[in-house]
């Protein structure tokens, strides 16, 4: 069988801060099993941004429906971006053991944070 | 505290039809996927059906696909499971449950019995 | 016939160790739990993905993994934990949920 290939086929993302953001991630096979995590940010000092097995991400929500047991849609939207949000974010699957361990990543995509448009009021 | 009640169990004759329902409470019912597991008198677990959070995808063994349909209320917190063209092999307790992420079991019902008899 | 084997019965002396193995999902696919069924009673979960105790069980219960075979292990065994055992899986390769014949434990004395 071919090996499982994490895909997140967006290098960037732009948004304007309020608004939310999605961000892609595909994999090309359900096995081996183990959940799927996104992070901003690599290396130890990396940002969880949400688990699929366990954890509140109350600005998170999966775009697909994750309880789907064929699912491979791993794509997320965030929402409320604000410029703090700015970064790369990495789909990262994990092997299942004790604990899991990571198995492969995707290339990560950046997200960049527009100014909020401001409304200019007219008078006439 | 996260509560599943099924009902709806009975005596039925063989090639007849029930439905059972289970109602759910103590958690977001819309949020987890959701399955039937069947225990025949004196025997084994065995599982008979499930359905994703949305119900739109919905799974079962050989040994009742085409004759049972789980089917899922959200707005009423209820799982269904209709059962078609019973056989004497169909007595058990069935035994709603609610999966994980990786679709294992964490909660259960207390059971309803099924009797398929003439 | 189960897709998944263990043993039909285990006995122990109380306050000793008891384990129940279960084998026969292949480890890149598959996800155990464990499951308790007292006579008359639903079952209740007591491990699931191989080696994860609900917050509620004791933790005399764990679930350990090697290779294609999971274990369940008893330590400290109480009369109370007499009962029938059952391992359950998820296979993702068939979007199936495959359970053992069981296993009686017996509390010995």
């Known amino acids: 069988e071919e090996e499982l290939q994490v895909i997140q086929p967006d290098k960037s993302v732009s948004v304007a801060a309020g608004e939310s953001a999605i961000l892609h991630c595909t994999v090309t096979s359900l096995i081996p099993v183990g959940p799927i995590q996104w992070f901003r940010g690599a290396g130890p000092a990396r940002e969880l941004i949400y688990n699929q097995k366990e954890g509140h991400f109350p600005r998170v929500t999966t775009v697909s429906e994750s309880t789907k047991r064929e699912n491979m849609d791993f794509s997320i939207s965030i929402s409320n971006i604000t410029p703090a949000d700015a970064g790369t974010y990495y789909c990262v699957k994990f092997r299942k053991g004790s604990p899991d361990t990571e198995f492969k990543s995707g290339a990560g995509t950046e997200l960049s944070v527009r100014a909020k448009p401001s409304h200019h009021h007219h008078h006439h | 505290e996260v509560q599943l009640v099924e009902s709806g169990g009975g005596v039925v004759q063989p090639g007849g039809s029930l439905r059972l329902s289970c109602a759910a409470s103590?958690?977001?019912?819309?949020?987890?996927?959701m399955s039937w597991v069947r225990q025949a008198p004196g025997k084994g677990l065995e599982w008979v059906a499930g359905?994703?959070?949305?119900?739109?995808?919905?799974y079962y063994p050989a040994s009742v696909k085409g004759r049972f349909t789980i089917s899922r209320d959200n707005s009423k917190n209820t799982l269904y499971l209709q059962m078609n063209s019973l056989r004497a092999e169909d007595t058990a307790v069935y035994y709603c449950?609610?999966?994980?992420?990786?679709?294992?079991?964490?909660?259960w019902g207390q059971g309803t019995l099924v009797t398929v008899s003439s | 016939s189960y897709e998944l084997t263990q043993p039909p019965s285990v006995s122990v002396s109380p306050g000793q160790t008891a384990r129940i193995t279960c084998s026969g999902g292949?480890?890149?696919?598959?996800?155990y739990a464990w499951y308790q069924q007292k006579p008359g009673q639903a079952p209740v979960t007591l491990i699931y993905?191989?080696?994860k105790r609900p917050s509620n069980i004791p933790e005399r219960f764990s679930g350990s993994s090697s290779g294609t075979t999971v274990t369940l292990t008893i330590s400290g065994v109480q009369a109370e934990d007499e009962a029938d055992y059952y391992c359950?899986?998820?296979?993702?390769?068939?979007?199936?949920?495959?359970f053992g014949g069981g296993t009686k434990l017996t509390v010995l004395g």
């Open positions: 359950g899986g998820y296979d993702q390769s068939s979007y199936t949920n495959p």
């Open positions: 993905s191989d080696d």
């Open positions: 359905i994703s959070a949305g119900g739109s995808d919905t």
């Open positions: 103590g958690f977001t019912f819309s949020s987890n996927a």
């Open positions: 449950a609610r999966e994980t992420w990786n679709h294992l079991f964490d909660y």
């Open positions: 292949s480890y890149s696919s598959y996800y």
